[in-house]
Interface confidence: low
């Protein structure tokens, strides 16, 4: 099959780093500077990505692979292939339209990116707060007071189900 395909389509023999040049009897020509082809059989080479401004070059473009960008210090990548750079904030902050703002009470952010998230509600898991939360750190939940009292059962029976809108019988 490959042989037949090659005879029918001379371009399939062109390796990555070249393109099938129709202007030159479909011979494989090397990609010109600032362009690349990452797969064989291509009829054109793609223009290399340029890492400018807030982007900086993580990997140079080569004839077979595109340049890869990352972000200058103080920024971090967003999107596939680092398509955007977003400003870093400090831990305990989140990025808003007006810049970096401290997390509101009851929320935290332990990274330089992303949004402030609510502290874990320990009581939802039947636990108590062992270490208070801060802007930078979530609360640490510990065992519930009942778990610590002597003779307490380790298994709590479930409360009876109540349908909304109905009074207990």
């Amino acid at each position: 099959f490959e042989r037949t395909r090659s005879l029918q389509d001379p371009c399939s023999n062109c390796p990555a780093g070249t393109f099938c040049d129709n202007n030159r009897n479909q011979i494989c020509s090397p990609c010109p500077p600032n362009s690349f082809s990452s797969a064989g059989g291509q009829r054109t080479c793609d223009i290399c990505r340029q890492c400018k401004g807030v982007f900086r070059t993580r990997k140079e473009c080569s004839s077979t692979s595109n340049a890869e960008c990352d972000c200058t210090p103080g920024f971090h990548c967003l999107g596939a292939g680092c398509s955007m750079c977003e400003q870093d904030c400090k831990q305990g902050q989140e990025l808003t339209k007006k810049g970096c703002k401290d997390c509101c009470f009851g929320t935290f952010n332990d990274q330089k990116r992303g949004i402030c998230r609510p502290w874990t509600n320990c009581s939802l898991d039947g636990k108590s707060v062992l270490v208070n939360g801060t802007k930078e750190r979530d609360v640490v939940c510990g065992p519930s007071p009942a778990d610590l009292s002597p003779g307490a059962s380790s298994v709590t029976p479930p409360a009876p189900a109540r349908e909304p809108g109905h009074s207990p019988q």
Epitope: G17, P33, N34, T57, R58
Partner: antibody, heavy 116, light 107 residues
Framework: QVQLVQSGAEVKKPGASVKVSCKAS????????MHWVRQAPGQRLEWMGW????????TYADDFKGRVTITRDTSASTAYMELSSLRSEDTAVYYC?????????WGQGTLVTVSS | DIQMTQSPSSLSASVGDRVTITCKAS??????VAWYQQKPGKAPKLLIY???IRHTGVPSRFSGSGSGTDFTLTISSLQPEDFATYYC?????????FGGGTKVEIK
């Protein structure tokens, strides 16, 4: 034609700083990045860093971080490389080189001698 | 950092000889290799970039080949002005690194 003309030779004492200039002509200065490379006597070429001449953002080789500062003056089409805390092993010829898929044009070199 | 190892470190040849210099990268650098010529007391001059593309004004007797980790600079018929030191350099990743050089001397 493209030309890069560097400042003259310098003799410095250990601990001092040196600033080498590189004046570009024959092309649009901000269209190409400028790299700095040095060569100690009888040694291989050693890359020091480069500057994005459009934005002014420098990138330094790890071996020189904290000691080298690369800047540019677009109005004068000139790049600068300053090396501080000089020691005897910094004695070398320092080159600027325009970059276009490779270092395609080089300055004539500036000999910096560090001696007490 | 990527290491570029050139061989031989020096060679003696006569005018008209075919000369081959090799450069081996410590990891795949695709085709992102350049070759430079340097004469004593002078700045390097670019000969070849992207492994095989001759720079403007470089004579056709200079050719480059290779990809991945193995690269070759060939001078098809050595001329008197070709006696110099030749360096390879990868530009695939930062920092760009140079080979140790090959000195071509007159036999």
């Amino acid at each position: 034609q493209v030309q890069l003309v560097q400042s003259g030779a310098e003799v410095k004492k250990p601990g001092a700083s040196v600033k080498v200039s590189c004046k570009a002509s024959g092309y649009t200065f901000t269209d190409y990045s400028m790299h700095w490379v040095r060569q100690a006597p009888g040694q291989r070429l050693e890359w020091m860093g480069w500057i994005n001449t459009e934005t002014g953002e420098p990138t330094y080789a790890d071996d020189f971080k904290g000691r080298v500062t690369i800047t540019r003056d677009t109005s004068a089409s000139t790049a600068y490389m300053e090396l501080s805390s000089l020691r005897s092993e910094d004695t070398a010829v320092y080159y600027c080189a325009r970059y276009d898929y490779a270092m395609d044009y080089w300055g004539q070199g500036t000999l910096v001698t560090v001696s007490s | 950092d990527i290491q570029m190892t050139q061989s031989p470190s020096s060679l003696s040849a006569s005018v008209g000889d075919r000369v081959t210099i090799t450069c081996k990268a410590s990891q795949d650098v695709s085709s992102a290799v350049a070759w430079y010529q340097q004469k004593p007391g002078k700045a390097p001059k670019l000969l070849i970039y992207w492994a095989s593309i001759r720079h403007t004004g470089v004579p056709s007797r200079f050719s480059g080949s290779g990809s991945g980790t193995d690269f070759t600079l060939t001078i098809s018929s050595l001329q008197p002005e070709d006696f110099a030191t030749y360096y390879c350099q990868q530009r695939y990743t930062t920092p760009p690194t140079f080979g140790g050089g090959t000195k071509v001397e007159i036999k």
